[in-house]
């Protein structure tokens, strides 16, 4: 029986050009984590294999950094990075646990963004 739960950073926002850390944490299970895959929609960004370590997709190697821990750091964010991200924990003997994070990349800085909506 799968007893574990995944906690994630949930819905997060970041500034264009900046960076963000995507974090998931698997708890309430003694299952062994054999691999964690990070995906954006159906595109594989990175793999952290318990035996062989981190592997970053060649398509993202300039903008994705491993860690901290089993998390993933996205750099040089663009508006196109807005969307759903999934951490997929492959475990034994439980099976697969999936966490979801929604990232919104804001076009303008927080200051500009705030100024645009200030009450006259």
């Amino acid at each position: 029986m799968m007893t574990g739960t995944i906690e994630t950073t949930g819905n997060i926002s970041a500034e264009k050009g900046g960076s963000i850390i995507l974090q998931c944490h698997l708890s309430s299970t003694t299952a062994q984590v054999t691999q964690v895959n990070w995906e954006q929609q159906d595109q594989l960004l990175a793999i952290c294999n318990a035996d062989l370590g981190w592997h970053i997709s060649p398509s993202f190697k300039d903008r994705v950094a491993p860690g901290p821990g089993l998390g993933l750091t996205l750099q040089s964010l663009t508006v196109n990075d807005t969307g759903e991200y999934f951490c997929i924990y492959h475990t034994y003997p439980d099976g697969t646990y999936t966490g979801r994070i929604f990232l919104e990349v804001l076009e303008s800085s927080v200051a500009e963004h705030g100024a645009r909506f200030q009450i006259p």
Partner: antibody
Framework: QVQLVQSGAEVKKPGASVKVSCKAS????????IHWVRQAPGQGLEWMGI????????SYARKFQGRVTMTRDTSTSTVYMELSSLRSEDTAVYYC??????????????WGQGTMVTVSS | EIVMTQSPATLSVSPGERATLSCRAS??????LAWYQQKPGQAPRLLIY???TRATGIPARFSGSGSGTEFTLTISSLQSEDFAVYYC??????????FGGGTKVEIK
Amino acid sequence: QVQLVQSGAEVKKPGASVKVSCKASGYTFPAYYIHWVRQAPGQGLEWMGIINPSLGLTSYARKFQGRVTMTRDTSTSTVYMELSSLRSEDTAVYYCARGGRTTWIGALDIWGQGTMVTVSS
Amino acid sequence: EIVMTQSPATLSVSPGERATLSCRASQSVSSNLAWYQQKPGQAPRLLIYGASTRATGIPARFSGSGSGTEFTLTISSLQSEDFAVYYCQQYVVWPPLTFGGGTKVEIK
């Protein structure tokens, strides 16, 4: 050209060990994973494990953990697979195959010719 | 582990006809799927990787499609040398990398 050449056929008794070699040539040996896959007579393909020839890191299928050891000798561009406590069900052709670059993942694009291991009393 | 299921187990086709082989993964493997051909007494040979990219030297009559959990290998016009066993394999989660049980393409 890129190739993997394996050692010759072996006949072993139950309980013994076997060590199969796989010599790589024609490419940068440390840059690509090497996998081991076996095939029992008339059966399908079964993945045994993988080794990173650069770092020596390994990952084994749970079924073989404790019985299989994969090593490499970078000076001769050779990978070894040792299987211990042999039983009759281990009778199979054992293949080494080159996987993706060690920085990412990939299919098995180059295969050795296979080594027949027969376990019989 | 990810279970790969191939169908049919055996496919009887006449030379010149089209053959369609299916492979299903128990969970998404994105496009990290390969197809191999194996003839009796020989090592497997890589045909398709990335679900749809032909390996070096593979004729254009072989094509792969699909993504996620459903994949297809199509041989547009079977030649005599194409009668063999075909395996699919996922290479995104290990251990273990997993193969399908194979589809034998035989002469009708």
